[in-house]
């Protein structure tokens, strides 16, 4: 039994990494395999996560991590049984993967103005919470080419648009995602998307 | 919110026991290791002992070592210092330090008296 | 046992001052300090940890340098609520050893 594909983490930098690897054949990760983490750190003990079968050679394994600070490193170990398949390292604040915001909410009725709110996916204490920016994503149902991304680089978590800027009368989506610039994070997931009927007032024509 | 909360001070003879006790709350107690500091009235910061999240592995200073014993009850998200043979010199504010990793947490403390 | 010495043990200084503070360990420690506040008859507040990493919280003016066995906490510009009591930590190896603390007094 061997690696194939070493284990590449990331971390949500609140309470979770997520590692994932894959095996040169097909593998029973979850009776056949161990991952043992533990924070470089005086006193830290060592953690055992049991993987989950990703695709037939494939693990994935969540490592729960109380507290995050961006000094912190651990140590990994992969067995099976009593042999020692790969041993790494993992600091998590140079693989951050945020959470996906919750909540999205669209606003319709507020005089000819679409509002977006969603919800920061962070507690306060948490140093992300003060640090993401986001990108909203807007598509209609009935037309595929008609898709566009906002980028909300301030850290309020809403979005105005004039609803004219979209077509009326038609179904339209929205789904967010979220980064950090300051740990040069990837994108977060996407939101799940939530719809709505667009429709506004055309303005009178004067003649 | 984390939070300690140390009790368990007080006024006692040389030569003398107490037990100080320290409740944890706002987090998982059992992850992370716990830490005894004291401070004499007027003086520095002195480490006394730290303990891991288990209870597997404790260490001690040598001025309290054989003297001094921390345990936990993680059952009761509670941390304990049990002091005998106490002296003048132990005289100190003792507080309990969550010290799992860097993000320090630390009680307001209990004031210990050794006097005759 | 790993020795930290401070310096100075006081400093009289003045709200907008730059204000420096030395810590050197007995032997090498990589990053593994952390500085303290203490304010009369409270607990003592994390500042810096790994030598250089500011605390959630803490006001960018506290800065933190050095590696091995030189260290350095720097407070940019002075403000009334930074007249305190600041100490070094090392986290290498047990016993955890502290500084024997600097007193930042007003000038």
């Known amino acids: 039994m061997k690696v194939l594909q070493e284990p590449t983490c990331v971390s949500d930098y609140m309470s979770i990494s997520t590692c994932e690897w894959k095996m040169n054949g097909p593998t029973n990760c979850s009776t056949e395999l161990r991952l043992l983490y533990q924070l470089v750190f005086l006193l830290s003990e060592a953690h055992t996560c049991i993987p989950e079968n990703n695709g037939g050679a494939g693990c994935v394994c969540h490592l729960l991590m109380d507290d995050v600070v961006s000094a912190d490193n651990y140590t990994l170990d992969l067995w099976a049984g009593q042999q020692l398949l790969w041993k790494g390292s993992f600091k998590p604040s140079e693989h951050v993967k945020p959470r996906a915001p919750g909540n999205l909410t669209v606003h319709t009725n507020v005089s000819d103005t679409l509002l977006l709110t969603w919800s920061n996916p962070y507690p306060p204490d948490n140093y992300l919470y003060n640090h993401l920016t986001y990108a909203v994503n807007i598509w209609s149902e009935n037309d595929p080419a008609d898709f566009r991304i906002y980028n909300v680089t301030y850290l309020e978590p809403s979005l105005r648009i004039a609803a004219s800027t979209l077509k009326s009368g038609i179904s339209y989506r929205a789904r967010v995602r979220a980064w950090a610039q300051c740990y040069n994070t990837t994108w977060s997931e996407w939101s799940p998307s939530t719809k709505w009927h667009n429709s506004y007032r055309e303005p009178f024509e004067q003649h | 919110e984390v939070q300690l909360l140390e009790s368990g001070g007080g006024l006692v003879q040389p030569g003398g026991s107490l037990r100080l006790s320290c409740a944890a709350s706002g987090f998982t107690f059992s992850s992370y290791a716990m830490s005894w500091v004291r401070q004499a009235p007027g003086k520095g910061l002195e480490w006394v002992s730290a303990?891991?999240?288990?209870?597997?592995?404790?260490y001690y200073a040598d001025s309290v070592k054989g003297r001094f014993t921390i345990s936990r009850d993680n059952s009761k998200n509670t941390l304990y210092l049990q002091m005998n043979s106490l002296r003048a010199e132990d005289t100190a504010i003792y507080y309990c330090a969550r010290y799992g990793n860097w993000n320090y947490i630390w009680g307001q403390g209990t004031l210990v008296t050794v006097s005759s | 046992d790993i020795q930290m010495t401070q310096s100075p043990s006081s400093v009289s200084a003045s709200v907008g001052d730059r204000v420096t503070i030395t810590c050197r360990a007995s032997q090498g420690i990589s990053s593994w300090l952390a500085w303290y506040q203490q304010k009369p008859g409270k607990a003592p507040k994390l500042l810096i940890y790994a030598a250089s990493s500011l605390q959630s919280g803490v006001p960018s003016r506290f800065s933190g340098s050095g590696s091995g066995t030189d260290f350095t906490l720097t407070i940019s510009s002075l403000q009334p609520e930074d007249f305190a009591t600041y100490y070094c930590?090392?986290?290498?190896?047990?016993?955890?050893?502290f500084g024997g603390g600097t007193k930042v007094e007003i000038k």
């Open positions: 930590q090392q986290a290498n190896s047990f016993p955890l050893t």
């Open positions: 303990i891991s999240g288990s209870g597997g592995s404790t």
